[in-house]
Interface confidence: medium
Amino acid sequence: MAVTACQGLGFVVSLIGIAGIIAATCMDQWSTQDLYNNPVTAVFNYQGLWRSCVRESSGFTECRGYFTLLGLPAMLQAVRALMIVGIVLGAIGLLVSIFALKCIRIGSMEDSAKANMTLTSGIMFIVSGLCAIAGVSVFANMLVTNFWMSTANMYTGMGGMVQTVQTRYTFGAALFVGWVAGGLTLIGGVMMCIACRGLAPEETNYKAVSYHASGHSVAYKPGGFKASTGFGSNTKNKKIYDGGARTEDEVQSYPSKHDYV
């Protein structure tokens, strides 16, 4: 039960995280104009990964896309790439994890396959989250560097303050969305990996216990449903089932009334 809960929660957390990464990538407010000492009449500039916007003092907003690829800073391209890689990995991870969920049965999929898929999706979520966090952090670092450079430029020059005051940009809402979303995806991935450990068949062999009853033996595997019935000579303690032990969380490999809950 705990494994199912961990896996399910990991999936939900990752789903929210990836939705957040997509939202952050699409958002226009990656960098916003620093409003320190800005006039009431000022326009408000903000920029995203794909376009930049201007909001007039009236509230009227106009956005223009970056219709160039080569003219954009390498850092911006790198951030775009990291976010897209994060989204793609996250989306694949979600797809894989859906099939890996214990509460969903597809044919006669073995638990070992589900465990592998859970681990795969977990790793994908972790990498996806790291990509998002890295992308947002690179952009944030770029902003901090530019902010202090423009601040320094404001106070240099002959008579103190240079007259052409540069527009300084600070952290936009998308950065915080990205950090939180990346963190959630990472946490979801870790939870999936933890769930995988509970799903994976252990390398322990259960000894079959023999019961002698009226000339034929029925060997029971404790906790299992498979029994071997032998006639005549099968009276020794043998390994009845050697496919690796199932955990107590295991669902039967053939359908029962509990399978599609």
């Epitope: 000492n37 006039p39 009431v40 009449t41 326009v43 007039e56 009236s58 509230g59 009227f60 052409t164």
Partner: antibody, heavy 117, light 107 residues
Framework: EVQLQQSGPELVKPGASVKMSCKAS????????IHWVKQKPGQGLEWIGY????????KNNEKFKGKATLTSDKSSSTAYMEISSLTSEDSAVYYC??????????WGQGTLVTVSA | DIQMNQSPSSLSASLGDTITITCHVS??????LSWYQQKPGNIPKLLIY???NLHTGVPSRFSGSGSGTGFTLTISSLQPEDIATYYC?????????FGAGTKLELK
Amino acid sequence: EVQLQQSGPELVKPGASVKMSCKASGYTFTRYIIHWVKQKPGQGLEWIGYFNPYNDDSKNNEKFKGKATLTSDKSSSTAYMEISSLTSEDSAVYYCAKLRQERIAYWGQGTLVTVSA
Amino acid sequence: DIQMNQSPSSLSASLGDTITITCHVSQNIDVWLSWYQQKPGNIPKLLIYKASNLHTGVPSRFSGSGSGTGFTLTISSLQPEDIATYYCQQGQSYPLTFGAGTKLELK
């Protein structure tokens, strides 16, 4: 080309009201706030207030509250200012202006209002 | 309200002179100050915005400087067409306020 075309001169009696217009062209009307400025003959400039066609918000200088009412008609890209309870103190040239950031780059040609019995 | 103290109120100068008009503001407005020129019977015309930026089409003999509370407009090599009244205006906060004006005359 941005243009602000104001209505013609007005000769009005004390106590009456006057409504002047300012037709904007050459830009998206709702994008910019329209400001109104008063200039008495031979004197300086005085800010009356603004009207925001984007959200129909207006703000008046305390001195002109209850005196000037600012409105607009988006369909005709026209801003209006109505001045009520006119006195000789209201005799002036009234300008509509388009503010970009902190600066007024475009002015209407002005509407001369003369209050006389 | 932000008070604008413009000086001098009138100024006589000769052609080719360099003249300076100052505008003192009652509180810090950073660089959010504009300068306008108004000739008799005409509308005001923007010269300088954001304290020192020359508006499109304005001759380079006009220049602005200052920040915070003290600003100056300088006209180098005065021309006959520069005879007008000059106003400063703050755009930091509402209500927008103008200086009383400086009337520039020829000697």
